[in-house]
């Protein structure tokens, strides 16, 4: 089901099909008998009730007010009323650019890093059943793609991919042909300087513990925004109900990187928790770093050289 129109201010291009869907739709279905009204106000006109007789371009269906198509004089405030529920939208209809396949004011900008995953999918769920065909244009030149229902680009970005991509959906309604255009301005940028993530502190840590007690192992790292930090243990035996990973904490560094901390909590320490590796790993597309913790019984600590011991 298409989600409701929650944005209170909407800009659309003249000549395209357009709809407003109110946000108490599920409620309206339950109260079929309730009076539901749509109103428009603009300039001198205050709250004029809308119905299919108001204009041949307007259609009302359940929760939706449709325009076939929307025109410049549709600019104004729209209201939906049902019992004590009211929803309001401010609609601004702008002129179509007759010299281009898209209107500059109705462009969504996206920045994609070179070599990163880049995707454009031409979809329009609301008008899906009415769409005959869809074309994808780059800088107003049609791209020859296999699927003419939902043309898609999926690739790792290259600098040559930069440009304006327009999805144009062609649809029929009451014997007339309409089109809906959605345009993306894609800018390809250099790979934003990523660091190789690093874990802080010694790579091997022996931790003195007592059986039956709890311990918190803290793992800290310097990493990039998209990097991940996690604990790994018990690879051969599956999980241990006494071991819990706490929520990751992050603080931004002045250089725009992240300082992360992730704690592994081991409760009611048993023999099975001793002398096994608890590995904390930080991973990025550029590499990984791992640090290991080994729990040792306090009584056995004399056997371990002081420089590898962590309390």
């Amino acid at each position: 089901a298409e989600s409701c129109t929650s944005r209170p201010h909407i800009t659309v291009v003249e000549g395209e099909p357009f709809y407003l869907k109110h946000c108490s739709c599920s409620l309206a279905h339950e109260i079929e008998t309730t009076t539901k009204s749509w109103y428009k106000s603009s300039g001198s006109q205050e709250h004029v009730e809308l119905n299919p007789r108001s204009s041949s371009r307007i259609a009302l269906h359940d929760c939706v007010l449709e325009f076939w198509p929307v025109e410049l004089n549709d600019t104004g405030s729209y209201f939906f009323q049902m019992k004590n529920y009211t929803q309001k939208w401010k609609l601004n209809v702008i002129r179509r650019n007759k010299h281009s396949c898209f209107t500059e004011r109705q462009v969504t900008s996206k920045i994609v890093e070179v070599k990163k995953f880049f995707q454009i999918t031409c979809e329009n769920s609301y008008y899906q059943t009415l769409v005959n065909s869809t074309s994808l244009y780059k800088n107003c030149k049609k791209l020859l793609l296999e699927n003419n229902k939902n043309p898609t680009i999926k690739k790792n970005a290259e600098f040559e991919d930069q440009g304006y991509y327009s999805c144009v959906h062609f649809l029929h309604h009451n014997g007339k042909l309409f089109n809906i255009t959605k345009t993306f301005n894609i800018t390809i940028v250099e790979d934003r300087s990523n660091i190789v993530p690093v874990l802080l502190g010694p790579k091997l840590n022996h931790v003195a513990v007592e059986l039956g007690k709890n311990v918190r192992l803290n793992c800290s790292a310097l990493l990039n925004e998209e990097d991940v930090i996690y604990w790994m243990f018990g690879e051969e035996n599956g999980s241990d109900p006494n071991i819990h990973e706490e929520k990751e904490m992050r603080i931004m560094t002045p250089e725009g990187k992240w300082h992360a901390s992730k704690v592994l909590r081991i409760e009611n320490i048993g023999e099975s928790n001793l002398n096994v590796l608890y590995n904390c790993t930080v991973a990025s597309t550029g590499g990984t770093d791992t640090k290991s913790f080994i729990l040792v019984r306090k009584a056995d600590m004399a056997d371990i050289p002081g420089h590898v011991f962590t309390r």
Partner: nanobody, 115 residues
Framework: DVQLQESGGGLVQPGESLRLSCTAS????????MGWYRQAPGKWRELVAR???????HYADSVKGRFTISRDNAKNTVTLQMNTLQFEDSAVYYC?????????WGQGTLVTVSS
């Protein structure tokens, strides 16, 4: 470059199920521990389930008993069966390697749990 393609997300009500699938374009896929990560708005990407090359699964506390991870090395796929979904499970779900350098992230698949 390795491409990861996640699918199967959608809008469900609390208590319902979803099955996510991920395909990797890598011939030695079977050698890697693979995992499902998720990222909710305003949160960090977290590892929720992983499966070793030998097929041993591991789960985060928050999903234990509800999610099941499996893999099909012949098809280069890893799946996540999510049962009894909760509001807190709403996130974009990604698959990737675990324990080694990450492959380039895919676009993920959005899971929304809403009543």
């Amino acid at each position: 470059d390795v491409q990861l393609q996640e699918s199967g997300g959608g809008l469900v009500q609390p208590g319902e199920s979803l099955r996510l699938s991920c395909t990797a374009s890598r011939s030695d896929f079977s050698r890697y521990t693979m995992g499902w990560y998720r990222q909710a708005p305003g949160k960090w990407r977290e590892l929720v389930a992983r499966i070793t090359s030998g097929g041993i699964p591991h789960y985060a506390d928050s999903v234990k008993g509800r999610f099941t991870i499996s893999r099909d090395n012949a098809k280069n796929t890893v799946t996540l069966q999510m049962n009894t979904l909760q509001f807190e499970d709403s996130a974009v779900y990604y698959c990737n390697t675990v324990g080694v350098a990450l492959w380039a992230w895919g676009q993920g698949t959005l899971v929304t749990v809403s009543s």
